[in-house]
């Protein structure tokens, strides 16, 4: 866990450092607490909205909160691209936009966010709890992916559109559990430190076993390199039950958002470099939900399959592939 998050490892003190013991004892808990709280700061956010006027129409919005330059965005559904997910659109900041059914319109909203309108009927129609994923390839951060879905109404017979709060809380129930575990872990860690207060203060030192993200400019098409790129992601719901949508959103009702920011990924830098990244707030309630998702995302239940990294805006090029980096 410590290795994945690149939390500095605890090392025995070196001779001659005892004099700083009091200072270190005061600082250490705060450093650890900061790391615990900021460990889940999101880097990629995903929002899924179903249009009330068109039951089979969805809008997916994704954004990247890193400071690097985005080189390619891939939107998929049914899971991450390359993990059984189906590509819906590929957006390149300079080369253009490619989209495939049931995607209707993909576009850049800003230099770091995109939107995709999906519609369909029959087999290609999206449904309430389909999982949508956005993968951002950026330089120098690497490849980041986040997934989200629109939670279905808990009562299929509802005649009025559901309000956002209950549905978001349904997701929060599970997330609070994960967050609780994380919080307990942090508190327990502090408790242990407090118990060992009389001992010499441990020295903070970056973990030597922390995996470093591959350089964004090196793209290798080999299976070995692909297997080395595992991107964690948060999957909400993957089963597809269109029936739950039938009466959930009558015509004329408001559309609503499920905001699912989560970070995923290869971090070449330590936590301090990304800890201050802002969370996109959409109302106080959603803002809280964002933060919880962020924390839950830090230690996901499972890891996605190998993802090919194309930091170049255009794919395997320059790194050798149908797109690459300059």
């Amino acid at each position: 866990m410590r290795t994945e998050a690149q939390v500095p490892a605890l090392q025995p003190p070196e001779p001659g450092l005892e004099g700083a013991m009091g200072h270190r004892t005061l600082v250490l808990p705060w450093v650890l607490l900061t790391l615990c709280v900021t460990a889940g700061t999101p880097e990629v956010w995903v929002q899924v909205r179903m249009e009330a006027t068109e039951l089979s129409s969805f809008t997916i919005r994704c954004g990247f909160l890193g400071s690097g330059s985005i080189s390619l965005v891939t939107v998929s559904w049914g899971g991450p691209n390359g993990a059984g997910g189906t590509t819906l659109a590929v957006l390149h900041p300079e080369r253009g936009i490619r989209q495939w059914a049931p995607a209707r319109q993909a576009r850049w909203e800003t230099q770091s966010s995109i939107s995709l309108i999906l519609e369909g009927s029959g087999a290609s129609s999206p449904c309430a709890n389909t999982t949508f994923c956005c993968k951002f390839a950026s330089f120098p951060e690497g490849s980041w992916e986040a997934c989200g879905s629109l939670p279905p109404s808990s009562d299929p017979g509802l005649s009025a559109p559901p309000t956002p709060a209950p549905i978001l809380r349904a997701d929060l129930a599970g997330i609070l559990g994960v967050s609780g575990v994380l919080l307990f872990g942090c508190v327990y860690l502090l408790h242990l430190l407090r118990r060992h207060k009389h001992r010499p203060a441990p020295r903070l030192q970056p973990s030597r076993t922390s995996p470093q993200a591959p350089r964004a400019r090196a793209w290798a098409p080999s299976q070995a390199s692909q297997a080395a790129l595992h991107v964690p992601y948060a999957t909400i719901n993957t089963s597809c039950r269109p029936a739950t949508l039938d009466t959930a959103h009558p015509h004329g009702g408001p559309s609503w958002w499920a905001s699912l920011p989560t970070h995923a990924a290869h971090r070449p830098q330590g936590p301090a470099a990304w800890a201050s990244t802002p969370i996109p707030a959409r109302g106080s309630f959603v803002s809280v939900e964002n933060g919880l998702y962020a924390q839950a995302g830090e230690r996901p239940p499972h890891t996605g399959p190998g993802l090919t990294l194309f930091p170049d805006p255009r794919g395997p090029r320059a790194m050798e592939g149908p797109l690459g980096v300059r």
Partner: antibody, heavy 114, light 113 residues
Framework: EVQLQQSGPELVKPGASVKISCKAS????????MNWVKQSHGKSLEWIGD????????NYNQKFKDKATLTVDKSSSTVYMELRSLTSEDSAVYYC???????WGHGTTLTVSS | DIVMTQSPSSLSVSAGEKVTMSCKSS????????????LAWYQQKPGQPPKLLIY???TRDSGVPDRFTGSGSGTDFTLTITSVQAEDLAVYYC?????????FGGGTKLEIK
Amino acid sequence: EVQLQQSGPELVKPGASVKISCKASGYTFTDYSMNWVKQSHGKSLEWIGDITPNNGSPNYNQKFKDKATLTVDKSSSTVYMELRSLTSEDSAVYYCASLFFDYWGHGTTLTVSS
Amino acid sequence: DIVMTQSPSSLSVSAGEKVTMSCKSSQSLLNSGNQKNYLAWYQQKPGQPPKLLIYGASTRDSGVPDRFTGSGSGTDFTLTITSVQAEDLAVYYCQNDHTYPYTFGGGTKLEIK
């Protein structure tokens, strides 16, 4: 190294159909779509359509919607284009090109003649 | 469909000279969201497939000599070759990378005197 290997030249009779292929290597095939482009002798380039391997849902230039059918075989990393009801107007060089047209196959020459 | 119009259709220059060719689109190729122009330039030498030179209206593809420069925005674009070399003998195409269907210009044939 990325390579797009296209099938050899074809000589077919009017009214017949032909299926040409483009085998990709050197990158993760399912990650990126493939375009097909037509170039009649001494003329410009015309985009026929594209298809993404892990979706299988093609986009077509309306002009070629009734002429071309794009398919994918993921197991062999190959994209196919079938052209039907051929006429002399279909005689051209057909290229496959990767997602953003940065890699191109060498082209397949199709000659429709009786 | 977006119509791409190139001019001149052909031109003949001596090695070392500067060459400019134009490409106009019937609709703007500027993406309002990220302020990028989705226009590409290709070079096609005799008997070969086209080769990507410029994308995003002005970004050179990897390995493309810096004598090739793309410029312009919206509907008017230009490809400039500052000092033409013998190996630049080719047809140059511009392409709408903005909207389906992706349309190409008629090409500008560059001949070396």
